[in-house]
């Protein structure tokens, strides 16, 4: 059978400061079991952008409803974009672990660039 793929269809997205940025991500399968998280950057210093289970992310909303059954769309929208939000965003699937979840597969990343707010 085909192994799960993490699809981030846009290599780059450009948004004007003050607007919202939609970062798209889709999975090709519901399994393996485990959460999906969004990060900015890669490696040990990456910044957690969204994790549904824990944390407070007031600027982030999910594109699909949190109550949608068997959802494969893990796109997010980030509001009130500023130049500090520029960077490459990764959608990452984790495999459920005990006690800790293990990174399973990452999307290719979407580079967010921020344009100056139109005058």
């Amino acid at each position: 059978e085909d192994e799960l793929q993490v699809i981030q269809p846009e290599k780059s997205v450009s948004v004007a400061a003050g607007e919202s940025a939609t970062l798209r991500c889709a999975m090709t399968s519901l399994i393996p079991v485990g959460p999906i998280m969004w990060f900015r950057g890669a490696g040990a210093g990456r910044e957690l952008i969204y994790n549904q289970k824990e944390g407070h992310f007031p600027r982030v909303t999910t594109v699909s409803e949190l109550t949608k059954r068997n959802n494969l769309d893990f796109s997010i929208s980030i509001s009130n974009i500023t130049p500090a939000d520029a960077g490459t965003y990764y959608c990452v699937k984790f495999r459920k672990g005990s006690p800790d979840d293990v990174e399973f597969k990452s999307g290719a990343g979407t580079e967010l660039s921020v344009r100056a707010k139109p005058s």
């Epitope: 059978e1 192994e3 799960l4 399968s29 519901l30 399994i31 393996p32 079991v33 485990g34 959460p35 999906i36 549904q52 289970k53 999910t62 699909s64 409803e65 949190l66 109550t67 949608k68 059954r69 068997n70 959802n71 893990f74 495999r95 459920k96 005990s98």
Partner: antibody, heavy 119, light 108 residues
């Protein structure tokens, strides 16, 4: 959706048994699957879950039970070794369902198969 | 492990009346809670998921509410087929998935 368990029966302590669950009516390979058991007159107890090779077990069965699946046959298995009297229960096969970014619950259940462990 | 405590263990209700029973979690499970009905001699049946969403085909007289650690299942105007055992299940933190001990709804 239909789930049909088989393989239950009467065995002595220390013996083995293999349960099967034949699934139909959905794309079996896309979903995690679970075994839940119910001792006579008691409540429900989660036993084991399998995703796509990722497996999870209750502490009470870890090291004795093995969950597996054959996606080409749309069949879920539970190999039960070193059986104990306290394993006596009706064993239900269940299909996992997820809510968006969250965990799993069980939207379809088989009718169950009775396993009796007695000397 | 998250422990789910259901109360009461048994609820005696007359047909046509309302039944309300609770499920308390030992720690916050957000909305990651499901309710199941099990009639005598039958397999469990999913009623509610995400604490409040009715499964397809479940009558409107069943409703779930609550979040965090306190949850309630309400059945308005009990029908004869509603006399059964009801279990809650959390899927916020696992393994293990955990179930409550059940509430038996019997005819008064």
């Amino acid at each position: 959706v239909q789930l049909v368990e088989s393989g239950g029966g009467v065995v002595r302590p220390g013996e083995s048994l293999r349960l099967s669950c034949a699934a139909s009516g959905f794309r079996f390979s896309n979903f995690a699957m679970t075994w839940v058991r119910q001792a006579p007159g008691e409540g429900l107890e989660w036993v084991s879950t399998i995703g796509s090779g990722d497996t999870y077990y209750a502490d009470s069965v870890k090291g004795r039970f093995t969950i597996s699946r054959d996606n080409s046959k749309n069949t879920l298995y539970l190999q039960m070794n070193s059986l104990r009297a306290e394993d006596t229960a009706v064993y239900y096969c269940a299909k996992d369902s997820t809510v968006s970014w969250s965990g799993d619950f069980f939207d379809y259940w088989g009718l169950g198969t009775l396993v009796t462990v007695s000397s | 492990e998250i422990v789910l405590t259901q109360s009461p263990a048994t609820l005696s209700v007359s047909p046509g009346e309302r039944a309300t029973f609770s499920c308390r979690a030992s720690q916050n499970v957000k909305n990651d809670l499901a309710w199941y009905q099990q009639r005598p001699g039958q397999a469990p049946r999913l009623l509610i998921y995400a604490a409040r969403i009715r499964e397809t085909g479940i009558p409107e007289r069943f409703s779930g509410s609550g979040s965090g650690t306190e949850f309630t299942l309400t059945i308005t105007s009990l029908q004869s087929e509603d006399f059964a055992v009801y279990y809650c299940q959390q899927y916020y933190d696992w393994p293990p998935f955990t179930f409550g001990g059940g509430t038996k709804v019997e005819i008064k």
